[in-house]
């Protein structure tokens, strides 16, 4: 229903704590360079204003839209043009164009230093001094680096963070309590970020219909006992929630997500038998739990679907009468039978089915034409299955670091024009798929591998869009979202690439590498590996292995030497010479 004051409505629904958190996230995602203090001041002003509207909905400006209120706040920031350049031009526009303009200026790769975690004692001190400010800093730092992070989920991660600090800061050995727990939260949050970014890309590039198809497939896999009407209702609601969050409407998004969680918990009987444990939790934990709830037990006697979608003489009539509903039921029926398929694969199958009906229903004898449609799915099903087998076998043989290196070589050959930091980041993320998915039971590997790879490749596309350099990448990123991963997998060595000149300084290292944490050391070595491939794109795996082994040996020797600097300066040039010879 319509409310006299939107801001009062949302404040009342969400409560002060969540309201403030969401407004902070919204401002941090829009203006990514502002300091925490600047944003905290704005948040307090907005909250105070919301409270006046709660007290009197007829008070001045309380009837304004949230976009108008928030946009006016952002546009009142001093030195906006100096700090944000052309983003300041957004402020000359009226709503809704002004908000669209802000959205277009969100930066997926802001030039901000990595979010460094303070050491345990310092962290516990500042947490104990002011937990609210501490958590505010967390929300601000994550939101500005991840401008599409799913806001209600970020509140959940902040709550996790809070609980970990509360527990570990009371321990004698704070460090060993905090590190593994916070690493776990960080890893989950980063995966959540790329997954949500993929959803927003789907929404932005292909609209609500594309996202809703994704939701139907995913929900049908998770809730195979729910009927199509129920799945459609959930998919529609989930689409609205995600549209709001992707569009910067974070208060509405969080409010609607809470409503959806409430609906699911009140209708467990028609949705799934697995929801009760989630529904017993408080709001943020409940919504998070529902978003990754285990699949319900499949009905034991689902019939083959060919009868309804291939053998029925009315297929074309049913399709023509309500195309999206008919395709939706196909996607629903296929997905509920196949929790072992990735959502991307299910969407490719539905797309193939749609294309077949479009073609065949225009012909003289449609049944003869579409009669073999299910058999034509063969290459679509085989391709990702083979991908999973090949890559998991390789991961099991090489381990995570070696697997990342193999992917780095492969992707540098596919797109050598892409910047080395982007290639290294992508390869490291793609390589984590092994640890994340290849250890799972066989029937869970495909959905895990392919849907994760798709999300990582979406980030590659977003970064490449900013500065397009590779025709290969542009080609794969221009097509439909579900075709991207197969497109990237099919890429081979870019024959148009002119190899980079060999620069000795690229492969010159100093003793400071010895004190770097293991992760940073790996990144240095992987940077060198990508540069080697850019110099010799057709180097064999054996040649590259020889060079990298030599390099690792060199680091090991010099880092153990009494006079490290001398070792690096004398042995370094010898290493460079050997590398050149090995790759000649």
């Amino acid at each position: 229903e319509a409310h006299k004051s939107e801001i009062a409505h949302r404040y009342n629904d969400l409560g002060e704590q969540h309201f403030k958190g969401l407004v902070l996230i919204a401002f941090s995602q829009y203006l990514q360079k502002c300091s925490y203090d600047e944003h905290a001041k704005l948040v307090q002003e907005v909250t105070d204003f919301a409270k006046t509207c709660v007290a009197d909905e007829s008070a001045a400006n309380c009837d304004k839209s949230l976009h108008t209120l928030f946009g006016d706040k952002l546009c009142a920031i001093p030195n906006l043009r100096e700090n944000y350049g052309e983003l300041a031009d957004c402020c000359t526009k009226q709503e809704p164009e002004r908000n669209e303009c802000f959205l277009q200026h969100k930066d997926d790769n802001p030039s901000l230093p990595p979010f460094e975690r303070p050491e345990a004692e310092a962290m516990c001190t500042s947490f104990k001094e002011n937990p609210t400010t501490f958590m505010g800093h967390y929300l601000h730092e994550v939101a500005r680096r991840h401008p599409y992070f799913y806001a209600p989920e970020l509140l959940y991660y902040a709550e996790q963070y809070n609980e970990i600090l509360t527990q570990c800061c009371a321990e004698a050995d704070k460090e060993s309590c905090l590190t593994p727990k916070l690493d776990g939260v960080k890893e989950k949050a980063l995966v959540s970020s790329v997954r949500q970014r993929m959803k927003c890309s789907s929404m932005q590039k292909f609209g609500e219909r594309a996202f809703k198809a994704w939701a139907v497939a995913r929900l049908s896999q998770t809730f195979p006992n729910a009927d199509f009407a129920e799945i459609t209702k959930l998919a529609t609601d989930l689409t609205k929630v995600n549209k709001e969050c992707c569009h910067g409407d974070l208060l509405e998004c969080a409010d609607d997500r809470a409503e959806l969680a409430k609906y699911m918990c009140e209708n467990q009987a028609t949705i799934s038998s697995k929801l009760q444990t989630c529904c017993d939790k408080p709001l943020l934990k409940k919504a998070h739990c529902l978003s990754e709830v285990e699949h319900d037990t499949m009905p034991a006697d689902l019939p083959a679907i060919a009868a309804d979608f291939v053998e029925d003489q009315e297929v074309c009539k049913n399709y023509a009468e309500a195309k999206d509903v008919f395709l939706g039921t196909f996607l629903y029926e296929y997905s509920r039978r196949h929790p072992d398929y990735s959502v991307s694969l299910l969407l490719r199958l539905a797309k193939k089915y749609e294309a077949t009906l479009e073609k065949c229903c225009a012909e003289a004898n449609p049944p003869a034409c579409y009669g073999t449609v299910l058999a034509e799915f063969q290459p679509l099903v085989e391709e990702p299955k083979n991908l999973v087998k090949t890559n998991c076998d390789l991961y099991e043989k090489l381990g995570e670091y070696g697997f990342q290196n193999a992917i780095l070589v492969r992707y540098t050959q596919k797109a050598p024009q892409v910047s080395t930091p982007t290639l290294v980041e992508a390869a490291r993320n793609l390589g984590r798929v092994g640890t994340k998915c290849c250890t799972l039971p066989e029937d869970q590997r495909l959905p895990c591998v392919e849907d994760y790879l798709s999300a990582i490749l979406n980030r590659v596309c977003l970064l490449h869009e900013k500065t397009p350099v590779s025709e290969h990448v542009t080609k794969c990123c221009s097509g439909s979202l579900v075709e991207r991963r197969p497109c990237f997998s099919a890429l081979t060595v870019d024959e148009t690439y002119v190899p980079k000149e060999f620069k000795a300084e690229t492969f010159t290292f100093h003793s400071d590498i010895c004190t770097l944490p293991e992760k940073e050391k790996q990144i240095k070595k992987q940077t060198a590996l990508a540069e080697l491939v850019k110099h010799k794109p057709k180097a064999t795996a054996e040649q590259l292995k020889t060079v990298m082994d030599d390099f690792a040996q060199f680091l090991d020797t010099c880092c153990k030497a009494a006079d490290k600097d001398t070792c690096f300066s004398t042995e370094g040039p010898n290493l460079v010479t050997r590398c050149k010879d090995a790759l000649a």
Partner: nanobody, 115 residues
Framework: QVQLQESGGGLVQPGGSLRLSCAAS????????MAWYRRAPGKERELVAL???????NYADSVKGRFTISRDYAKNTVYLQMDSLKPEDTAAYYC?????????WGQGTQVTVSS
Amino acid sequence: QVQLQESGGGLVQPGGSLRLSCAASGSIFTFYRMAWYRRAPGKERELVALITTDTSTNYADSVKGRFTISRDYAKNTVYLQMDSLKPEDTAAYYCNVRNVERDYWGQGTQVTVSS
């Protein structure tokens, strides 16, 4: 074309065990439902046990606690471990698998429980 290769049947004493296996080949699709049925002489065919993609299982009341159905996803194979066999378990056992296209039936393997 889908072929089902059943094996493991035979003659066994009451209280003994057998393991039936059924390997499916020639299908491009994962079978989302794999099952064992049986037909005793002069009786209707009955469902013994089934397993779905998500490894949920269902059993006939008469075999609960004695028989265990399992599957090897990668090999498209379904197994039936039969323990504490009774004379009334004597029957021809048929493997049944289902993908999105249709159902497929095996030729059957004979299990005889007798002393």
